[in-house]
């Protein structure tokens, strides 16, 4: 089979600070040295890019400075963290992995992680 399998958890609950982390694992059919990981968000039938990073195997993932994502890699596993999430950001977050170099190119897309975000209740005023 020439398809690359990508696994990610079905559900993740964001912390009260709006941070969600999940692992994206891929079964590489080749020996890639350059890998691109993209997080997509699917809402209704629309798919948008949340963040993307290209990394060399053995090195750290580097997202753009203004990205809401951070991550680390270990072998064929990527630990992704998305921050700054609010209740309205609840949705399906899909891990997309591309083996960029050396050839051949492979694409793998996970089934998505449903991230639930609950905005914290505002602290009640106190008279202390």
């Amino acid at each position: 089979c020439k398809a690359m399998h990508v696994a990610q958890p079905a559900v993740v609950l964001a912390s009260s600070r709006g941070i969600a982390s999940f692992v994206c694992e891929y079964a590489s059919p080749g020996k890639a040295t350059e890998v691109r990981v993209t997080v997509l968000r699917q809402a209704d039938s629309q798919v948008t890019e949340v963040c993307a990073a290209t990394y060399m195997m053995g090195n750290e993932l580097t997202f753009l400075d203004d990205s809401i994502c951070t991550g680390t890699s270990s072998g064929n596993q990527v630990n992704l963290t998305i921050q700054g999430l609010r209740a309205m950001d609840t949705g399906l977050y899909i891990c997309k992995v591309e083996l960029m170099y050396p050839p051949p190119y492979y694409l793998g897309i996970g089934n998505g992680t449903q991230i639930y975000v609950i905005d914290p209740e505002p602290c009640p005023d106190s008279d202390f």
């Epitope: 020439k2 398809a3 290209t54 051949p104 492979y106 694409l107």
Partner: antibody, heavy 118, light 107 residues
């Protein structure tokens, strides 16, 4: 709106060169893999080449490898296909297409016609 | 390289008929399959990706199914505007191979 516009096609003699351009608008070119697909008269679709994101990685169909060069200028939001040593069998409509976020080609240009004939 | 084979190469059906086109990959490609519609003299248009997901704006009479090596595009009720050539394509690895196309005509 999101669109791709090809230009640069024409009639050229075998062995000569031609450069096609594809101007993208309505989206950020550097976020997508971009492809060229061609269609010979009365025939089906044939994938020609892809260029990735920052332009560092490219792949070509065996039929054009060593003769065609795909490049991109993200600052101008434009793609280029340099075609050298053209042959009669390169005669086709050339389409620029965007590899969508999920992999399929979701946006296509209107195409530009290349005729290689003596 | 993985080959994509479509059948039939052409078909003629009546308005309202259910039309089925099949596409077979020479090796398993999971669900990394797209279907395109190309009307005469026009640009190809994405209909379905991920084997069964309808592209935004595509009429619901179009549907896709399959996984691995065998895939199907179905038009539940053929309309005059569906006259076109339909192509399958695999996109999980290079090269991005298309099927040879299926020409759909109205009887």
């Amino acid at each position: 709106q999101v669109q791709l516009v090809e230009s640069g096609g024409g009639v050229v003699q075998p062995g000569r060169s031609l450069r096609l351009s594809c101007a993208a608008s309505g989206f950020t070119l550097s976020s997508y893999g971009m492809h060229w697909v061609r269609q010979a008269p009365g025939k089906g679709l044939e994938w020609v080449a892809v260029i990735w994101y920052d332009g560092s990685n490219k792949y070509y169909a065996d039929s054009v490898k060593g003769r065609f060069t795909f490049s991109r200028d993200n600052s101008k939001n434009t793609l280029y296909l340099q075609m050298n040593s053209l042959r009669a069998e390169d005669t086709a409509v050339y389409y620029c297409a965007r590899g969508g976020l999920t992999g399929a080609f979701d946006i296509w240009g209107q195409g530009t016609t290349v005729t290689v004939s003596s | 390289d993985i080959q994509m084979t479509q059948s039939p190469s052409s078909l003629s059906a009546s308005v309202g008929d259910r039309v089925t086109i099949t596409c077979r990959a020479s090796q398993g490609i999971s669900n990394y399959l797209a279907w395109y519609q190309q009307k005469p003299g026009k640009v190809p248009k994405l209909l379905i990706y991920a084997a069964s997901t309808l592209q935004s704006g595509v009429p619901s009479r179009f549907s896709g199914s399959g996984s691995g090596t065998d895939f199907t595009l179905t038009i539940s009720s053929l309309q005059p505007e569906d006259v076109a050539t339909y192509y399958c394509q695999k996109y999980n690895s290079a090269p991005w191979t298309f099927g040879q196309g299926t020409k759909v005509e109205i009887k």
